[in-house]
């Protein structure tokens, strides 16, 4: 995507503290990499309402990370 440059995180700022569970279509975890030195939690919203970054330090994000890691490992 032309807006992206290497070495940049996907999210601007720390992210929202919470997203209504009913609005969540999907959650993706981006782990630290060469492009971004922090974990990022990206929420895809229902009804084509785009995506939002969830603050990885928030309670909701920690629960999502735990869930995803349990599923994957």
């Amino acid at each position: 995507f032309p807006m992206f440059k290497r070495g940049r995180c996907l999210c601007i700022g720390p992210g929202v503290k919470a997203v209504k569970v009913a609005d969540i279509e999907k959650a993706s975890i981006m782990y630290p990499s060469n492009n971004c030195d922090k974990i990022e939690v990206i929420i895809t919203l229902k009804e084509n309402k785009g995506q939002r970054c969830l603050n990885p330090k928030s309670k909701q994000a920690r629960l999502i990370i735990k869930k995803v890691e349990r599923k994957n490992f």
Partner: nanobody, 126 residues
């Protein structure tokens, strides 16, 4: 309480310049993406430019690249949109908006933004 107040709009001749200001209160710029949008009569609201004060990155719609410049003054909690070489098709109401948790991919999408100013009219005459 989050508040955004735009100023600096007006009537200008084609080829002229204007500087819009967006004064933010109730939050710090570093935590948010600040975007400028515009809406011409009978048209949809479109993203013009965005800035991430946390890392200084800026984004522009193709239609304004090279003519408009977005900047921020964190001490004043204000974002500016310098508009040069204005064209009649730039005529619109200009809004500033603040969004938290915005992905770079969606910086020019109005659905990414939670808070909006009341708008300032920009009219470019030929």
């Amino acid at each position: 309480e989050v508040q955004l107040v735009e100023s600096g709009g007006g009537l200008v001749q084609a080829g002229g310049s204007l500087r819009l200001s967006c004064a933010a209160s109730g939050f710090t710029l570093d935590d948010y993406a600040i975007g400028w949008f515009r809406q011409a009569p009978g048209k949809e609201r479109e993203g013009v430019s965005c800035i991430s004060s946390s890392d200084g990155s800026t984004y522009y719609a193709d239609s304004v690249k090279g003519r408009f410049t977005i900047s921020s003054d964190n001490a004043k909690n204000t974002v500016y949109l310098q508009m040069n070489s204005l064209k009649p098709e730039d005529t619109a109401v200009y809004y500033c908006a603040a969004g938290q948790g915005v992905l770079r991919l969606w910086v020019l999408s109005s659905s990414s933004y939670d808070y909006w100013g009341q708008g300032t009219q920009v009219t470019v005459s030929s």
